[in-house]
Protein backbone atom coordinates (compact mmCIF):
# COMPACT_ATOMS: atom_id res chain seq x y z
CA UNK A 1 0.00 0.00 0.00
CA UNK A 2 0.89 3.68 -0.14
CA UNK A 3 3.13 5.03 2.58
CA UNK A 4 1.36 7.41 4.98
CA UNK A 5 2.76 10.85 4.07
CA UNK A 6 2.51 11.81 7.74
CA UNK A 7 5.30 9.36 8.55
CA UNK A 8 7.73 11.95 7.16
CA UNK A 9 6.82 14.47 9.86
CA UNK A 10 9.46 14.42 12.60
CA UNK A 11 9.08 14.70 16.33
CA UNK A 12 8.33 18.30 17.26
CA UNK A 13 5.76 18.63 14.49
CA UNK A 14 2.20 17.54 13.87
CA UNK A 15 0.68 16.28 10.66
CA UNK A 16 -2.55 17.07 8.87
CA UNK A 17 -2.88 14.85 5.81
CA UNK A 18 -5.76 16.96 4.53
CA UNK A 19 -3.20 19.54 3.48
CA UNK A 20 -0.52 19.49 0.80
CA UNK A 21 2.11 20.79 3.20
CA UNK A 22 1.59 18.30 5.98
CA UNK A 23 4.09 19.07 8.73
CA UNK A 24 3.68 22.01 11.09
CA UNK A 25 5.72 22.88 14.18
CA UNK A 26 4.17 22.22 17.56
CA UNK A 27 2.98 25.49 19.08
CA UNK A 28 4.67 26.77 22.24
CA UNK A 29 4.11 24.64 25.33
CA UNK A 30 3.21 21.55 23.33
CA UNK A 31 5.19 18.61 22.03
CA UNK A 32 5.19 15.50 19.88
CA UNK A 33 7.70 12.90 20.96
CA UNK A 34 7.43 10.72 17.85
CA UNK A 35 7.11 11.33 14.16
CA UNK A 36 3.85 11.16 12.23
CA UNK A 37 1.64 12.44 15.04
CA UNK A 38 -1.67 14.10 14.11
CA UNK A 39 -1.57 16.48 17.08
CA UNK A 40 0.86 17.92 19.57
CA UNK A 41 0.23 17.21 23.24
CA UNK A 42 0.05 20.02 25.78
CA UNK A 43 3.11 20.10 28.02
CA UNK A 44 2.67 18.88 31.56
CA UNK A 45 2.86 21.74 34.06
CA UNK A 46 4.55 21.11 37.39
CA UNK A 47 2.53 23.28 39.75
CA UNK A 48 1.85 23.47 43.45
CA UNK A 49 3.54 20.60 45.28
CA UNK A 50 5.09 19.46 41.97
CA UNK A 51 8.46 20.82 40.89
CA UNK A 52 9.92 20.87 37.37
CA UNK A 53 12.68 18.29 37.05
CA UNK A 54 12.99 18.63 33.28
CA UNK A 55 11.56 21.41 31.14
CA UNK A 56 9.19 20.61 28.31
CA UNK A 57 10.52 20.80 24.77
CA UNK A 58 8.89 20.50 21.38
CA UNK A 59 9.87 16.81 21.34
CA UNK A 60 9.47 15.70 24.97
CA UNK A 61 7.12 16.36 27.85
CA UNK A 62 8.10 18.08 31.06
CA UNK A 63 8.99 15.84 34.00
CA UNK A 64 8.01 16.67 37.56
CA UNK A 65 9.23 15.68 40.97
CA UNK A 66 8.00 16.83 44.39
CA UNK A 67 8.90 19.80 46.51
CA UNK A 68 10.87 19.14 49.74
CA UNK A 69 8.71 17.43 52.31
CA UNK A 70 6.99 15.28 49.68
CA UNK A 71 7.96 12.28 47.57
CA UNK A 72 6.78 10.89 44.22
CA UNK A 73 4.25 8.12 43.80
CA UNK A 74 2.91 6.55 40.64
CA UNK A 75 4.24 6.33 37.12
CA UNK A 76 6.00 9.50 36.05
CA UNK A 77 5.49 11.02 39.48
CA UNK A 78 1.75 11.38 39.00
CA UNK A 79 1.25 12.04 42.71
CA UNK A 80 3.16 13.65 45.55
CA UNK A 81 2.79 12.13 49.01
CA UNK A 82 3.75 13.90 52.21
CA UNK A 83 6.97 12.77 53.91
CA UNK A 84 6.84 11.66 57.53
CA UNK A 85 9.70 11.30 60.00
CA UNK A 86 11.39 8.00 60.60
CA UNK A 87 9.33 6.21 63.21
CA UNK A 88 6.09 7.42 61.66
CA UNK A 89 3.64 6.45 58.92
CA UNK A 90 1.20 8.49 56.87
CA UNK A 91 -2.48 8.01 57.67
CA UNK A 92 -5.59 9.82 56.52
CA UNK A 93 -5.15 12.09 59.54
CA UNK A 94 -1.49 12.86 58.79
CA UNK A 95 1.76 11.48 60.17
CA UNK A 96 1.35 9.20 63.19
CA UNK A 97 4.00 7.52 65.36
CA UNK A 98 4.51 3.80 64.80
CA UNK A 99 2.64 1.68 67.35
CA UNK A 100 4.71 -0.26 69.87
CA UNK A 101 6.13 -3.34 68.19
CA UNK A 102 6.42 -1.69 64.77
CA UNK A 103 9.03 0.49 63.08
CA UNK A 104 9.68 2.59 59.97
CA UNK A 105 13.25 3.51 59.05
CA UNK A 106 12.22 5.71 56.08
CA UNK A 107 10.35 8.98 55.47
CA UNK A 108 7.74 7.11 53.46
CA UNK A 109 5.84 3.85 53.66
CA UNK A 110 4.21 2.13 56.62
CA UNK A 111 5.25 0.91 60.02
CA UNK A 112 6.25 -2.78 59.92
CA UNK A 113 6.32 -5.28 62.76
CA UNK A 114 9.59 -5.96 64.49
CA UNK A 115 11.17 -9.25 63.53
CA UNK A 116 10.01 -12.04 65.84
CA UNK A 117 13.38 -13.53 66.83
CA UNK A 118 11.83 -16.44 68.71
CA UNK A 119 10.28 -17.79 65.50
CA UNK A 120 13.82 -18.66 64.45
CA UNK A 121 14.81 -19.84 67.90
CA UNK A 122 16.88 -16.71 68.41
CA UNK A 123 17.02 -14.20 71.22
CA UNK A 124 16.75 -10.39 70.96
CA UNK A 125 20.23 -8.91 70.85
CA UNK A 126 19.18 -5.26 70.41
CA UNK A 127 15.70 -4.02 71.21
CA UNK A 128 13.60 -2.47 68.46
CA UNK A 129 12.51 1.16 68.38
CA UNK A 130 9.99 3.13 66.31
CA UNK A 131 12.82 3.81 63.84
CA UNK A 132 14.72 0.52 63.89
CA UNK A 133 13.97 -3.20 63.80
CA UNK A 134 15.20 -5.50 66.55
CA UNK A 135 18.50 -7.24 66.06
CA UNK A 136 18.28 -10.97 66.73
CA UNK A 137 21.05 -12.68 68.69
CA UNK A 138 22.50 -16.11 67.99
CA UNK A 139 20.58 -19.27 68.62
CA UNK A 140 22.39 -22.21 70.23
CA UNK A 141 22.92 -23.76 66.79
CA UNK A 142 24.60 -20.55 65.64
CA UNK A 143 27.18 -20.78 68.36
CA UNK A 144 29.10 -23.49 66.49
CA UNK A 145 32.40 -22.23 64.98
CA UNK A 146 32.11 -20.15 61.75
CA UNK A 147 28.40 -19.47 62.15
CA UNK A 148 26.91 -16.06 61.44
CA UNK A 149 25.93 -14.17 64.59
CA UNK A 150 23.28 -11.80 63.28
CA UNK A 151 20.13 -12.54 61.28
CA UNK A 152 18.97 -9.87 58.85
CA UNK A 153 15.49 -8.41 59.44
CA UNK A 154 12.51 -10.01 57.76
CA UNK A 155 11.59 -8.53 54.34
CA UNK A 156 9.14 -5.62 54.38
CA UNK A 157 5.51 -6.42 53.76
CA UNK A 158 3.62 -4.55 51.05
CA UNK A 159 1.90 -1.26 52.02
CA UNK A 160 -1.56 -2.01 53.36
CA UNK A 161 -3.34 1.30 52.88
CA UNK A 162 -3.96 3.78 50.09
CA UNK A 163 -1.67 6.81 50.38
CA UNK A 164 -2.89 10.28 51.08
CA UNK A 165 -1.89 11.84 47.80
CA UNK A 166 -1.95 15.09 45.99
CA UNK A 167 -2.55 14.62 42.30
CA UNK A 168 -1.65 16.94 39.45
CA UNK A 169 -0.86 17.16 35.81
Amino acid sequence: GLQDPCSNCPAGTFCDNNRNQICSPCPPNSFSSAGGQRTCDICRQCKGVFRTRKECSSTSNAECDCTPGFHCLGAGCSMCEQDCKQGQELTKKGCKDCCFGTFNDQKRGICRPWTNCSLDGKSVLVNGTKERDVVCGPSPADLSPGASSVTPPAPAREPGHSPQDIEGR
Partner: antibody, heavy 114, light 107 residues
Amino acid sequence: EVQLVESGGGLVQPGGSLRLSCAASGFTFSEFGMHWVRQAPGKGLEWVSYISSGGSTIYYADSVKGRFTISRDNAKNSLYLQMNSLRAEDTAVYYCARDWVDYWGQGTLVTVSS
Amino acid sequence: EIVMTQSPATLSLSPGERVTLSCKASENVGSYVSWYQQKPGQAPRLLIYGASNRYTGVPARFSGSGSGTDFTLTISSVEPEDFAVYYCGQSYSYPLTFGGGTKLELK
Protein backbone atom coordinates in the same frame (compact mmCIF):
# COMPACT_ATOMS: atom_id res chain seq x y z
CA GLU B 1 18.00 31.37 31.02
CA VAL B 2 17.44 30.60 27.34
CA GLN B 3 19.97 32.31 25.10
CA LEU B 4 20.52 32.29 21.35
CA VAL B 5 23.53 34.16 19.99
CA GLU B 6 24.05 34.57 16.25
CA SER B 7 27.41 35.33 14.65
CA GLY B 8 29.10 35.27 11.25
CA GLY B 9 27.38 38.21 9.58
CA GLY B 10 29.23 40.86 7.65
CA LEU B 11 29.73 42.54 4.29
CA VAL B 12 30.02 40.26 1.28
CA GLN B 13 29.98 40.83 -2.47
CA PRO B 14 27.16 39.50 -4.66
CA GLY B 15 27.83 35.86 -5.52
CA GLY B 16 29.86 35.42 -2.35
CA SER B 17 29.33 33.11 0.64
CA LEU B 18 28.91 33.41 4.38
CA ARG B 19 28.32 30.94 7.17
CA LEU B 20 26.14 32.03 10.07
CA SER B 21 26.23 30.34 13.47
CA CYS B 22 23.78 30.33 16.33
CA ALA B 23 25.02 29.26 19.77
CA ALA B 24 22.25 27.99 22.06
CA SER B 25 22.24 27.70 25.84
CA GLY B 26 19.80 27.45 28.71
CA PHE B 27 17.65 24.71 27.18
CA THR B 28 17.99 21.20 25.76
CA PHE B 29 19.00 22.18 22.24
CA SER B 30 18.84 18.62 20.88
CA GLU B 31 15.12 18.45 21.72
CA PHE B 32 14.08 21.48 19.67
CA GLY B 33 13.75 22.11 15.98
CA MET B 34 15.26 25.42 14.94
CA HIS B 35 14.45 28.20 12.47
CA TRP B 36 16.27 30.95 10.69
CA VAL B 37 14.19 34.09 10.10
CA ARG B 38 15.45 37.26 8.46
CA GLN B 39 14.45 40.91 8.35
CA ALA B 40 15.57 43.28 5.60
CA PRO B 41 16.34 46.83 6.83
CA GLY B 42 13.07 48.64 7.56
CA LYS B 43 11.01 45.65 6.40
CA GLY B 44 9.01 42.81 7.92
CA LEU B 45 9.95 39.29 9.00
CA GLU B 46 10.66 36.54 6.47
CA TRP B 47 11.05 32.89 7.45
CA VAL B 48 14.14 31.32 5.82
CA SER B 49 14.61 27.72 6.94
CA TYR B 50 13.77 25.03 9.50
CA ILE B 51 15.65 21.97 10.74
CA SER B 52 14.12 19.31 13.00
CA SER B 53 15.63 18.37 16.37
CA GLY B 54 17.60 15.46 14.96
CA GLY B 55 18.37 17.15 11.63
CA SER B 56 16.41 14.66 9.54
CA THR B 57 13.80 17.11 8.24
CA ILE B 58 14.68 20.39 6.57
CA TYR B 59 12.56 23.08 4.89
CA TYR B 60 13.56 26.19 2.96
CA ALA B 61 11.78 29.26 1.69
CA ASP B 62 11.59 29.27 -2.11
CA SER B 63 13.68 32.44 -2.18
CA VAL B 64 16.74 30.65 -0.75
CA LYS B 65 16.26 27.07 -1.96
CA GLY B 66 19.37 25.70 -3.66
CA ARG B 67 21.56 28.49 -2.28
CA PHE B 68 21.28 28.17 1.51
CA THR B 69 21.95 25.09 3.64
CA ILE B 70 20.80 24.73 7.23
CA SER B 71 22.57 22.33 9.59
CA ARG B 72 23.11 21.71 13.28
CA ASP B 73 25.57 20.14 15.67
CA ASN B 74 23.72 18.98 18.77
CA ALA B 75 26.97 18.09 20.53
CA LYS B 76 28.02 21.75 20.23
CA ASN B 77 24.53 23.20 20.80
CA SER B 78 24.94 25.04 17.53
CA LEU B 79 22.83 25.87 14.48
CA TYR B 80 24.32 26.96 11.16
CA LEU B 81 23.25 28.60 7.90
CA GLN B 82 25.60 28.26 4.95
CA MET B 83 24.72 30.98 2.43
CA ASN B 84 26.08 30.74 -1.09
CA SER B 85 25.45 32.75 -4.28
CA LEU B 86 24.40 35.70 -2.19
CA ARG B 87 22.28 38.46 -3.74
CA ALA B 88 21.56 42.05 -2.78
CA GLU B 89 18.06 41.01 -1.69
CA ASP B 90 19.58 38.69 0.94
CA THR B 91 20.71 41.77 2.88
CA ALA B 92 19.01 41.46 6.25
CA VAL B 93 19.39 40.82 9.94
CA TYR B 94 19.30 37.02 10.39
CA TYR B 95 17.73 35.61 13.54
CA CYS B 96 17.72 32.06 14.86
CA ALA B 97 14.71 30.91 16.84
CA ARG B 98 13.49 27.75 18.56
CA ASP B 99 10.75 25.88 16.73
CA TRP B 100 8.19 27.21 19.22
CA VAL B 101 9.34 30.62 17.86
CA ASP B 102 9.29 31.88 21.43
CA TYR B 103 12.95 32.78 21.88
CA TRP B 104 14.99 34.63 19.26
CA GLY B 105 18.61 35.64 19.16
CA GLN B 106 19.67 39.27 18.86
CA GLY B 107 20.41 38.80 15.14
CA THR B 108 23.44 39.18 12.92
CA LEU B 109 23.52 41.61 9.98
CA VAL B 110 24.38 40.31 6.52
CA THR B 111 25.06 42.97 3.90
CA VAL B 112 25.42 41.93 0.25
CA SER B 113 26.86 44.78 -1.75
CA SER B 114 29.57 45.51 -4.26
CA GLU C 1 1.92 30.14 0.54
CA ILE C 2 -0.40 31.64 3.12
CA VAL C 3 -0.44 35.44 3.04
CA MET C 4 -0.94 37.28 6.32
CA THR C 5 -2.30 40.82 5.97
CA GLN C 6 -2.17 43.27 8.87
CA SER C 7 -4.12 46.48 9.25
CA PRO C 8 -3.71 49.30 9.79
CA ALA C 9 -0.07 49.82 8.85
CA THR C 10 0.28 52.60 11.42
CA LEU C 11 -1.79 53.53 14.43
CA SER C 12 -1.35 56.79 16.37
CA LEU C 13 -2.69 56.87 19.90
CA SER C 14 -2.12 58.03 23.44
CA PRO C 15 -1.24 56.03 26.56
CA GLY C 16 -4.30 54.63 28.29
CA GLU C 17 -6.23 54.05 25.09
CA ARG C 18 -7.59 50.66 24.04
CA VAL C 19 -6.29 49.37 20.72
CA THR C 20 -7.19 46.48 18.44
CA LEU C 21 -4.85 45.26 15.70
CA SER C 22 -6.13 43.10 12.85
CA CYS C 23 -4.53 40.21 10.99
CA LYS C 24 -6.16 38.28 8.15
CA ALA C 25 -4.93 35.00 6.65
CA SER C 26 -5.46 34.21 2.98
CA GLU C 27 -6.74 30.76 3.95
CA ASN C 28 -7.82 28.88 7.05
CA VAL C 29 -4.97 28.57 9.55
CA GLY C 30 -7.03 27.25 12.46
CA SER C 31 -5.71 28.84 15.62
CA TYR C 32 -2.03 28.58 14.65
CA VAL C 33 -1.35 32.31 14.83
CA SER C 34 1.16 34.13 17.02
CA TRP C 35 1.67 37.81 17.74
CA TYR C 36 5.07 39.43 18.22
CA GLN C 37 6.24 42.81 19.47
CA GLN C 38 9.41 44.36 18.08
CA LYS C 39 11.17 47.49 19.25
CA PRO C 40 13.93 49.24 17.24
CA GLY C 41 17.20 47.34 17.33
CA GLN C 42 15.68 44.38 19.16
CA ALA C 43 14.57 40.89 18.21
CA PRO C 44 10.84 40.12 18.07
CA ARG C 45 9.24 39.09 21.37
CA LEU C 46 6.45 36.52 21.49
CA LEU C 47 3.26 37.88 23.06
CA ILE C 48 0.46 35.51 22.03
CA TYR C 49 0.48 31.99 20.61
CA GLY C 50 -2.33 29.70 19.52
CA ALA C 51 -4.33 32.85 18.68
CA SER C 52 -5.32 33.52 22.30
CA ASN C 53 -2.69 32.15 24.73
CA ARG C 54 -0.59 34.76 26.51
CA TYR C 55 3.06 33.74 26.61
CA THR C 56 4.96 33.56 29.91
CA GLY C 57 5.63 36.97 31.41
CA VAL C 58 3.40 38.90 29.01
CA PRO C 59 1.20 41.48 30.80
CA ALA C 60 -2.52 40.77 31.05
CA ARG C 61 -3.37 43.90 29.06
CA PHE C 62 -2.41 41.94 25.92
CA SER C 63 -5.02 39.53 24.60
CA GLY C 64 -5.57 37.70 21.33
CA SER C 65 -8.63 36.25 19.68
CA GLY C 66 -9.84 34.75 16.43
CA SER C 67 -9.63 31.54 14.43
CA GLY C 68 -9.75 30.49 10.81
CA THR C 69 -8.79 33.60 8.86
CA ASP C 70 -9.49 36.61 11.11
CA PHE C 71 -7.38 37.42 14.17
CA THR C 72 -7.03 40.36 16.54
CA LEU C 73 -4.54 41.54 19.13
CA THR C 74 -6.01 43.84 21.77
CA ILE C 75 -4.13 46.05 24.21
CA SER C 76 -6.69 47.05 26.83
CA SER C 77 -4.83 50.15 28.00
CA VAL C 78 -1.68 51.13 26.14
CA GLU C 79 1.41 51.77 28.27
CA PRO C 80 4.34 53.95 27.11
CA GLU C 81 6.51 50.84 26.64
CA ASP C 82 3.96 49.32 24.21
CA PHE C 83 4.84 51.68 21.35
CA ALA C 84 6.50 49.30 18.89
CA VAL C 85 5.80 47.29 15.75
CA TYR C 86 3.48 44.27 16.07
CA TYR C 87 3.61 41.28 13.74
CA CYS C 88 1.27 38.35 13.36
CA GLY C 89 2.58 35.06 12.01
CA GLN C 90 1.13 31.68 11.10
CA SER C 91 2.66 28.28 11.84
CA TYR C 92 -0.14 26.26 10.25
CA SER C 93 1.99 25.32 7.27
CA TYR C 94 5.38 25.89 5.73
CA PRO C 95 6.59 28.31 4.68
CA LEU C 96 5.88 30.10 7.92
CA THR C 97 4.65 33.56 7.01
CA PHE C 98 4.30 36.88 8.82
CA GLY C 99 2.18 39.95 8.31
CA GLY C 100 3.74 43.22 7.23
CA GLY C 101 3.41 44.67 10.73
CA THR C 102 1.43 47.41 12.46
CA LYS C 103 3.38 50.31 13.92
CA LEU C 104 1.97 51.72 17.14
CA GLU C 105 3.16 55.31 17.47
CA LEU C 106 2.62 58.03 20.04
CA LYS C 107 0.01 60.58 19.02
